[in-house]
């Protein structure tokens, strides 16, 4: 079953290559287990950036080597992606799945265009 998902259209990563955005979903029922996936679309290719499954009221748990962190509050998730470089500029899509209890719902946002600008190297100070 389909579900509405909203996210910002554009986000600019900071000088340390970190970008944060909110992913909000219209929960149609009492889900207790939710899965959030961040997908990156660039040059018509879609790749998974990170994913986390969480129980309502608990923290999101990404894999230890994940570049993502996040927190949840109700039906919104605050996502942070770290270690971004200019080459990582692209459309980052939030996918939300209500895993339990049935029925299963899935929604995909329109994507957040994340712009990453590599910082200029500091000039040598002689």
């Amino acid at each position: 079953k389909a579900m509405h998902v909203a996210q910002p259209a554009v986000v600019l990563a900071n000088s340390r290559g970190t970008a944060s955005f909110v992913c909000e979903y219209a929960s149609p029922g009492k889900a207790t287990e939710v899965r959030v996936t961040v997908l990156r679309q660039a040059d018509s290719q879609v790749t998974e950036v990170c994913a986390a499954t969480y129980m309502m009221g608990n923290e999101l748990t990404f894999l230890d080597d994940s570049i993502c962190t996040g927190t949840s509050s109700g039906n919104q998730v605050n996502l942070t992606i770290q270690g971004l470089r200019a080459m990582d500029t692209g459309l980052y899509i939030c996918k939300v799945e209500l895993m339990y209890p049935p029925p299963y719902y899935m929604g995909i946002g329109n994507g957040t265009q994340i712009y990453v600008i590599d910082p200029e190297p500091c000039p040598d100070s002689d």
Partner: nanobody
């Protein structure tokens, strides 16, 4: 801090109609999605309708779709639930709840709401 107060409940005959109001006596409601729920004696709390911050997004479970309509007037800091063709099984205590969100969506899950009113009794009986 929003504080919610429901009103408009009462005794109504089967087939009749009622309009419930949910007003905030604290913060402005325009930053909050609002949901209506009811609890019948001896039953779990049931979702009825929700409306996003701007009013453009609404959602209903199949059980009340077509009979219940949720609207909001942000200028009056109030959300309304219009109920028509009421049945005996609509009897219960009706609660509104609020959740601060970033975008325009809303949730039908009671788990997502952190601020609740005290409720207003609706009795459908001849």
């Amino acid at each position: 801090q929003v504080q919610l107060v429901e009103s408009g409940g009462g005794l109504v005959q089967p087939g009749g109609s009622l309009r419930l109001s949910c007003a905030s006596s604290g913060d402005t409601l325009e930053s909050f999605a609002v949901g209506w729920f009811r609890q019948a004696p001896g039953k779990e709390r049931e979702e009825l309708a929700c409306i996003g911050r701007t009013g453009e997004f609404t959602d209903y479970p199949g059980s009340v779709k077509g009979r219940f309509t949720i609207t909001r007037d942000n200028a009056k800091n109030t959300v309304y639930l219009e109920m028509v063709n009421l049945k005996a099984e609509d009897t219960g205590v009706y609660y509104c709840a609020a959740e601060r969100l970033v975008f325009h969506l809303c949730s039908l899950s009671e788990y997502d709401y952190d601020t609740w009113g005290q409720g207003t009794q609706v009795t459908v009986s001849s």
